[in-house]
Protein backbone atom coordinates (compact mmCIF):
# COMPACT_ATOMS: atom_id res chain seq x y z
CA UNK A 1 0.00 0.00 0.00
CA UNK A 2 0.96 3.65 -0.38
CA UNK A 3 1.18 4.20 3.38
CA UNK A 4 3.43 1.17 3.86
CA UNK A 5 5.78 2.23 1.05
CA UNK A 6 6.09 5.77 2.43
CA UNK A 7 6.77 4.40 5.92
CA UNK A 8 9.55 2.24 4.46
CA UNK A 9 11.17 5.27 2.85
CA UNK A 10 10.69 7.46 5.94
CA UNK A 11 12.38 4.78 8.08
CA UNK A 12 15.63 5.48 6.19
CA UNK A 13 15.67 8.99 7.61
CA UNK A 14 16.69 8.97 11.26
CA UNK A 15 15.99 12.60 12.14
CA UNK A 16 12.34 13.27 13.05
CA UNK A 17 12.32 16.59 11.16
CA UNK A 18 13.58 14.91 7.99
CA UNK A 19 11.02 12.10 8.43
CA UNK A 20 8.31 14.77 8.55
CA UNK A 21 9.67 16.21 5.30
CA UNK A 22 9.07 12.80 3.71
CA UNK A 23 5.52 12.56 5.02
CA UNK A 24 4.81 16.13 3.85
CA UNK A 25 6.01 15.18 0.40
CA UNK A 26 3.66 12.21 0.30
CA UNK A 27 0.61 14.40 0.87
CA UNK A 28 -1.70 14.87 -2.11
CA UNK A 29 -1.29 18.03 -4.17
CA UNK A 30 -2.54 17.81 -7.73
CA UNK A 31 -1.87 21.45 -8.55
CA UNK A 32 1.94 21.39 -8.59
CA UNK A 33 4.79 19.06 -9.43
CA UNK A 34 6.96 17.58 -6.69
CA UNK A 35 9.78 19.82 -7.87
CA UNK A 36 7.66 22.96 -7.58
CA UNK A 37 6.49 21.99 -4.10
CA UNK A 38 10.01 21.12 -2.89
CA UNK A 39 11.35 24.48 -4.10
CA UNK A 40 9.55 26.17 -1.21
CA UNK A 41 11.30 24.23 1.54
CA UNK A 42 13.54 26.37 3.74
CA UNK A 43 14.94 23.50 5.85
CA UNK A 44 17.81 22.65 3.54
CA UNK A 45 18.84 19.87 1.15
CA UNK A 46 18.26 16.89 3.46
CA UNK A 47 14.63 17.88 3.88
CA UNK A 48 14.25 18.63 0.17
CA UNK A 49 15.70 15.22 -0.72
CA UNK A 50 13.33 13.37 1.65
CA UNK A 51 10.35 15.44 0.52
CA UNK A 52 11.13 14.87 -3.15
CA UNK A 53 11.74 11.13 -2.82
CA UNK A 54 8.47 10.54 -0.96
CA UNK A 55 6.52 12.91 -3.19
CA UNK A 56 7.69 11.17 -6.37
CA UNK A 57 7.03 7.67 -5.00
CA UNK A 58 3.58 8.68 -3.72
CA UNK A 59 2.70 10.31 -7.05
CA UNK A 60 3.79 7.23 -8.98
CA UNK A 61 1.84 4.88 -6.72
CA UNK A 62 -1.27 7.05 -6.94
CA UNK A 63 -0.94 7.14 -10.73
CA UNK A 64 -0.65 3.34 -10.82
CA UNK A 65 -3.70 2.93 -8.61
CA UNK A 66 -5.84 5.24 -10.75
CA UNK A 67 -4.52 3.55 -13.92
CA UNK A 68 -5.63 0.15 -12.56
CA UNK A 69 -9.02 1.63 -11.69
CA UNK A 70 -9.41 2.83 -15.27
CA UNK A 71 -8.49 -0.62 -16.62
CA UNK A 72 -11.05 -2.25 -14.33
CA UNK A 73 -13.67 0.25 -15.46
Amino acid sequence: TLQKKIEEIAAKYKHSVVKKCCYDGACVNNDETCEQRAARISLGPRCIKAFTECCVVASQLRANISHKDMQLG
Epitope: E35, A39, R40, I41, G44, P45, I48, K49
Partner: antibody
Protein backbone atom coordinates in the same frame (compact mmCIF):
# COMPACT_ATOMS: atom_id res chain seq x y z
CA UNK B 1 31.22 28.44 3.60
CA UNK B 2 28.57 28.86 0.90
CA UNK B 3 29.36 31.59 -1.61
CA UNK B 4 27.55 32.81 -4.71
CA UNK B 5 29.78 34.93 -6.92
CA UNK B 6 28.02 36.89 -9.64
CA UNK B 7 29.45 38.41 -12.81
CA UNK B 8 30.19 42.13 -13.03
CA UNK B 9 28.03 45.09 -14.07
CA UNK B 10 26.69 45.27 -17.62
CA UNK B 11 25.91 48.29 -19.80
CA UNK B 12 23.81 47.16 -22.74
CA UNK B 13 21.88 48.76 -25.58
CA UNK B 14 18.08 48.54 -25.92
CA UNK B 15 17.00 45.44 -27.83
CA UNK B 16 20.16 43.54 -26.95
CA UNK B 17 20.57 40.49 -24.68
CA UNK B 18 22.75 39.91 -21.64
CA UNK B 19 23.85 36.81 -19.75
CA UNK B 20 24.57 36.99 -16.01
CA UNK B 21 26.46 34.24 -14.21
CA UNK B 22 26.36 33.00 -10.62
CA UNK B 23 29.15 30.65 -9.52
CA UNK B 24 28.39 28.56 -6.45
CA UNK B 25 30.98 27.24 -4.02
CA UNK B 26 30.95 25.70 -0.54
CA UNK B 27 28.26 23.13 -1.33
CA UNK B 28 27.46 20.40 -3.85
CA UNK B 29 25.83 22.34 -6.66
CA UNK B 30 24.18 19.22 -8.04
CA UNK B 31 22.59 18.33 -4.69
CA UNK B 32 19.08 19.27 -3.53
CA UNK B 33 19.51 23.03 -3.82
CA UNK B 34 17.39 25.33 -5.96
CA UNK B 35 18.80 28.48 -7.52
CA UNK B 36 16.40 31.42 -7.53
CA UNK B 37 16.79 34.71 -9.37
CA UNK B 38 15.44 38.02 -8.11
CA UNK B 39 15.16 41.48 -9.67
CA UNK B 40 15.46 44.74 -7.73
CA UNK B 41 14.84 47.94 -9.65
CA UNK B 42 16.49 51.07 -8.24
CA UNK B 43 14.94 52.04 -4.90
CA UNK B 44 12.24 49.42 -5.32
CA UNK B 45 11.23 46.10 -3.82
CA UNK B 46 12.24 42.59 -4.85
CA UNK B 47 10.66 40.61 -7.66
CA UNK B 48 11.02 36.85 -8.08
CA UNK B 49 12.00 35.85 -11.62
CA UNK B 50 12.07 32.07 -11.25
CA UNK B 51 14.14 29.11 -10.15
CA UNK B 52 16.23 26.37 -11.69
CA UNK B 53 16.86 23.02 -10.01
CA UNK B 54 20.42 22.14 -11.11
CA UNK B 55 19.95 18.44 -10.29
CA UNK B 56 17.38 18.02 -13.08
CA UNK B 57 17.58 21.31 -14.97
CA UNK B 58 13.90 21.88 -14.14
CA UNK B 59 12.73 25.49 -14.16
CA UNK B 60 9.72 27.45 -13.00
CA UNK B 61 9.18 31.09 -13.98
CA UNK B 62 7.15 33.98 -12.76
CA UNK B 63 4.69 34.48 -15.65
CA UNK B 64 5.83 38.12 -15.84
CA UNK B 65 9.33 37.03 -16.89
CA UNK B 66 8.43 34.28 -19.35
CA UNK B 67 10.00 35.20 -22.66
CA UNK B 68 12.24 37.75 -20.93
CA UNK B 69 14.46 35.51 -18.79
CA UNK B 70 15.97 32.08 -19.49
CA UNK B 71 17.64 30.14 -16.68
CA UNK B 72 20.32 27.53 -17.32
CA UNK B 73 23.12 25.78 -15.42
CA UNK B 74 26.52 24.34 -16.17
CA UNK B 75 26.96 21.57 -13.61
CA UNK B 76 30.63 21.04 -14.49
CA UNK B 77 31.51 24.55 -13.30
CA UNK B 78 28.78 24.85 -10.62
CA UNK B 79 27.49 27.96 -12.38
CA UNK B 80 23.95 29.18 -12.94
CA UNK B 81 23.14 31.60 -15.75
CA UNK B 82 20.31 33.96 -16.50
CA UNK B 83 19.89 35.39 -19.97
CA UNK B 84 17.70 38.48 -20.39
CA UNK B 85 16.60 39.38 -23.91
CA UNK B 86 14.97 42.23 -25.83
CA UNK B 87 16.17 44.62 -23.15
CA UNK B 88 14.45 47.93 -22.44
CA UNK B 89 15.00 50.61 -19.81
CA UNK B 90 12.47 48.71 -17.62
CA UNK B 91 15.03 45.92 -17.32
CA UNK B 92 17.63 48.20 -15.74
CA UNK B 93 18.04 46.77 -12.24
CA UNK B 94 20.20 44.77 -9.87
CA UNK B 95 19.73 41.03 -10.38
CA UNK B 96 20.47 38.54 -7.60
CA UNK B 97 20.89 34.80 -7.52
CA UNK B 98 19.88 33.14 -4.26
CA UNK B 99 20.15 29.57 -3.07
CA UNK B 100 19.25 27.49 -0.08
CA UNK B 101 16.46 28.53 -1.12
CA UNK B 102 17.05 32.12 0.02
CA UNK B 103 19.60 31.65 2.78
CA UNK B 104 22.49 32.54 0.47
CA UNK B 105 22.57 35.47 -1.94
CA UNK B 106 25.00 36.62 -4.57
CA UNK B 107 26.35 40.18 -4.38
CA UNK B 108 24.08 41.27 -7.23
CA UNK B 109 24.74 42.26 -10.84
CA UNK B 110 23.77 45.72 -12.02
CA UNK B 111 22.35 45.77 -15.54
CA UNK B 112 21.95 49.19 -17.15
CA UNK B 113 20.07 49.47 -20.43
CA UNK B 114 20.94 52.66 -22.25
CA UNK B 115 21.43 53.84 -25.81
CA UNK C 1 -0.89 36.12 -7.20
CA UNK C 2 -0.62 36.84 -3.48
CA UNK C 3 0.04 40.53 -2.83
CA UNK C 4 1.93 41.41 0.34
CA UNK C 5 1.39 44.89 1.79
CA UNK C 6 3.87 46.11 4.38
CA UNK C 7 3.23 48.92 6.83
CA UNK C 8 4.44 51.40 7.63
CA UNK C 9 6.55 52.08 4.52
CA UNK C 10 9.00 54.12 6.62
CA UNK C 11 9.36 54.21 10.39
CA UNK C 12 11.69 55.98 12.77
CA UNK C 13 12.69 54.80 16.23
CA UNK C 14 15.12 55.73 18.98
CA UNK C 15 17.62 53.21 20.36
CA UNK C 16 15.98 51.08 23.05
CA UNK C 17 12.47 51.49 21.64
CA UNK C 18 10.25 48.54 20.73
CA UNK C 19 9.11 48.49 17.10
CA UNK C 20 6.66 46.34 15.17
CA UNK C 21 6.15 46.22 11.43
CA UNK C 22 3.40 44.32 9.69
CA UNK C 23 2.90 42.33 6.52
CA UNK C 24 -0.63 41.68 5.24
CA UNK C 25 -1.38 39.15 2.52
CA UNK C 26 -4.20 39.43 -0.02
CA UNK C 27 -5.06 35.79 0.68
CA UNK C 28 -4.08 33.27 3.34
CA UNK C 29 -0.42 32.23 3.51
CA UNK C 30 0.91 29.14 5.27
CA UNK C 31 3.09 30.21 8.22
CA UNK C 32 5.77 27.75 7.02
CA UNK C 33 6.21 29.83 3.89
CA UNK C 34 6.34 33.39 5.26
CA UNK C 35 9.87 34.77 5.57
CA UNK C 36 11.54 38.10 6.39
CA UNK C 37 14.71 39.63 4.91
CA UNK C 38 16.91 42.48 6.04
CA UNK C 39 18.59 44.65 3.42
CA UNK C 40 21.05 47.41 4.21
CA UNK C 41 21.81 50.12 1.68
CA UNK C 42 24.01 48.86 -1.15
CA UNK C 43 24.02 45.26 0.12
CA UNK C 44 22.26 42.03 -0.80
CA UNK C 45 19.20 40.98 1.20
CA UNK C 46 19.81 38.59 4.10
CA UNK C 47 17.40 35.93 5.28
CA UNK C 48 16.38 37.24 8.71
CA UNK C 49 13.36 35.23 9.92
CA UNK C 50 12.09 32.08 8.23
CA UNK C 51 8.79 30.25 8.56
CA UNK C 52 7.19 33.17 10.43
CA UNK C 53 9.10 32.93 13.70
CA UNK C 54 12.48 31.21 13.30
CA UNK C 55 15.53 33.45 13.49
CA UNK C 56 18.15 32.85 10.82
CA UNK C 57 21.71 32.14 11.90
CA UNK C 58 23.37 35.12 13.57
CA UNK C 59 20.19 37.16 14.01
CA UNK C 60 20.03 38.81 17.48
CA UNK C 61 17.40 37.53 19.93
CA UNK C 62 15.80 40.98 20.13
CA UNK C 63 14.11 40.12 16.82
CA UNK C 64 10.96 38.03 16.73
CA UNK C 65 8.28 37.15 14.23
CA UNK C 66 4.69 36.07 14.56
CA UNK C 67 1.40 35.78 12.72
CA UNK C 68 -0.85 33.47 10.74
CA UNK C 69 -3.28 33.54 7.84
CA UNK C 70 -3.13 36.97 6.25
CA UNK C 71 -1.41 38.95 9.01
CA UNK C 72 2.25 38.69 10.04
CA UNK C 73 4.62 40.91 11.98
CA UNK C 74 8.28 41.43 12.79
CA UNK C 75 9.12 42.93 16.18
CA UNK C 76 12.35 44.32 17.59
CA UNK C 77 12.15 44.42 21.38
CA UNK C 78 14.86 47.05 21.81
CA UNK C 79 16.10 48.74 18.66
CA UNK C 80 19.83 49.28 18.11
CA UNK C 81 21.58 51.52 15.59
CA UNK C 82 22.72 48.50 13.54
CA UNK C 83 19.07 47.57 12.88
CA UNK C 84 18.66 50.48 10.45
CA UNK C 85 17.68 48.75 7.20
CA UNK C 86 14.76 47.86 4.97
CA UNK C 87 12.84 44.74 5.96
CA UNK C 88 10.94 42.71 3.36
CA UNK C 89 8.41 39.96 3.92
CA UNK C 90 8.12 37.19 1.36
CA UNK C 91 5.59 34.44 0.77
CA UNK C 92 6.29 31.11 -0.86
CA UNK C 93 2.84 29.72 -0.18
CA UNK C 94 1.85 29.99 -3.83
CA UNK C 95 3.40 30.81 -7.19
CA UNK C 96 4.60 33.28 -8.10
CA UNK C 97 6.61 33.84 -4.99
CA UNK C 98 6.13 37.49 -3.95
CA UNK C 99 7.78 40.08 -1.71
CA UNK C 100 6.23 42.95 0.18
CA UNK C 101 7.12 46.55 -0.65
CA UNK C 102 9.38 46.78 2.40
CA UNK C 103 9.51 48.75 5.63
CA UNK C 104 12.44 51.11 5.97
CA UNK C 105 13.56 51.44 9.58
CA UNK C 106 15.46 54.62 10.44
CA UNK C 107 17.18 55.15 13.77
CA UNK C 108 16.95 58.62 15.35
Amino acid sequence: EVRLQQSGPELVKPGASVRISCKASGYTFNDYYYMNWVKQSHGKSLEWIGYIFPKTGGTHYNQRFKGKATLTVDKSSSTAYMELRSLTSEDSAVYYCASGPFAYWGQGTLVTVSA
Amino acid sequence: EIVLTQSPAIMSASPGEKVTMTCRASSSVSSSYLHWYQQKSGASPKLWIYSTSNLASGVPARFSGSGSGTSYSLTISSVEAEDAATYYCQQYSGYPLTFGGGTKLEIK
